[in-house]
């Protein structure tokens, strides 16, 4: 089944998708649609590359990472509910039924408004999920210590930070990866 | 591998109370909605109502409104639905779904629980 | 509480025709609408989510189209294990289902 992806209202969010390229440059076409991958295509695509650019791309989402170097991930920006759903990412190798497919689920939770605590020095507590990923393998949580009193606005910027960078490295390991060549 | 175990067939007389279980397996119950929804035969599909295991919310139609009640335990991964006052109209099959996330559509459903009100 | 109706309680069709399904909403509910196929015996599956996304595993030949309060759910080509009951849902509001249409092939 596809794998797993989640973000809260409001927030960015991240599906990883990633091939590498036979050679620096030589760069293989991609479609992100919405709906799992039909046969051929992309159905309701989003965003699309050829061989040397992003030629199309619908607003709110865009790729965030290198996608010459084959980081095809995709950002989906201020997500709402309607986010929610199956997602394509098709890697478009020339070639008759070369087409790697990969269908991820994003699952958009809402914010629930909560009263503030007064202290919050356990972050994983405050947002138990919003930082795990769910890949291949076991879960992989990244944890926030403990750091100084600050209000829920910079929890909420911080986690969303760590989302855009260090998580992205992490996902690279359990996203869709594939080698071309 | 998702899957929503529901349990077994009931009879009871009209106007006594039933509570029906749902044991899910390969997910956990605290990531999602999860729904009850009833069929009568030739009535189609009627939602009963849902619950956030994760705390507690939960959310009746109308019709059922103090008269059913979903609530779940997240520690055996399970979810309930309490009916009460029970008619021969509430005699159907009754099914556990999981939300695909927070959307109100489903997908996954566990077998159906048979419930018969008869005297 | 929103209504959908579907109007035809039977098709009948043949293998390899194409037929389409349609649900109607008593109220704008967008396009958060989702169709459910229920064969004998067996409890519903989810085939389109939001009108028109198909959801995983679900063959190319189900399409499903329309936004406001008019809904159409397509099969391209009809196959003989396509026989079953198809539900229209919303999930605009508290969700609602249409009563059913029995696909039969002839």
């Known amino acids: 089944s596809e794998v797993e992806y989640r973000a809260e209202v409001g927030q960015n969010a991240y599906l990883p998708c990633f091939y590498t390229p036979a050679a620096p440059g030589n760069l293989v076409p991609v479609c992100w649609g919405k709906g799992a991958c039909p046969v051929f295509e992309c159905g309701n695509v989003v965003l699309r590359t050829d061989e040397r650019d992003v030629n199309y791309w619908t607003s709110r989402y865009w790729l965030n990472g290198d996608f010459r170097k084959g980081d095809v991930s995709l950002t989906i920006e201020n997500v709402t509910l309607a986010d929610s759903g199956i997602y394509c990412c098709r890697i478009q190798i020339p070639g008759i039924m070369n087409d790697e497919k990969f269908n991820l689920k994003l699952v958009i939770k809402p914010a629930k408004v909560t009263p503030a605590p007064t202290r919050q020095r356990d972050f994983t507590a405050a947002f138990p999920r919003m930082l795990t990923t769910r890949g291949h393998g076991p879960a992989e949580t990244q944890t926030l210590g403990s750091l100084p009193d600050i209000n829920l606005t910079q929890i909420s910027t911080l986690a969303n930070e760590l989302r855009d960078s260090r998580l992205a490295n992490d996902l690279r390991d359990s996203g869709a990866t594939i080698r071309i060549g | 591998e998702v899957q929503l175990q529901q349990s077994g067939a009931e009879v009871v007389r009209p106007g006594a109370s039933v509570k029906l279980s749902c044991t899910s397996s390969g997910f956990n119950i605290k990531d999602y909605y999860l729904h009850w929804v009833m069929q009568r035969t030739e009535h189609g599909l009627n939602w009963i109502g849902r619950i956030d295991p994760d705390d507690a919310e939960t959310k009746y139609a109308p019709q059922f409104q103090g008269r059913a009640t979903i609530t779940a335990d997240t520690s055996s991964n399970t979810a309930y639905l309490q009916l009460s006052s029970l008619t021969s109209e509430d005699t159907a099959v009754y099914y556990c779904?999981?939300?695909?996330?927070?959307?109100?559509?489903?997908?996954?459903w566990g077998q159906g629980t048979t419930l018969t009100v008869s005297s | 509480d929103i209504v959908m109706t579907q109007s035809h309680k039977f098709m009948s069709t043949s293998v390899r025709d194409r037929v389409s399904i349609t649900c109607k909403a008593s109220q704008d509910v967008s396009t958060a609408v989702a169709w459910y196929q229920q064969k004998p015996g067996q409890s519903p599956k989810l085939l389109i989510y939001?009108?028109?996304y198909r959801y995983t595993g679900v063959p190319d030949r189900f399409t499903g189209s329309g936004s406001g309060t008019d809904f159409t759910f397509t099969i391209s080509s009809v196959q003989a294990e396509d026989l079953a009951v198809y539900y229209c849902q919303q999930h605009y509001s508290t969700p609602t289902f249409g009563g059913g249409t029995k696909l039969e092939i002839q």
């Open positions: 939001s009108a028109s």
């Open positions: 779904t999981r939300d695909f996330g927070y959307t109100d559509y489903f997908d996954y």
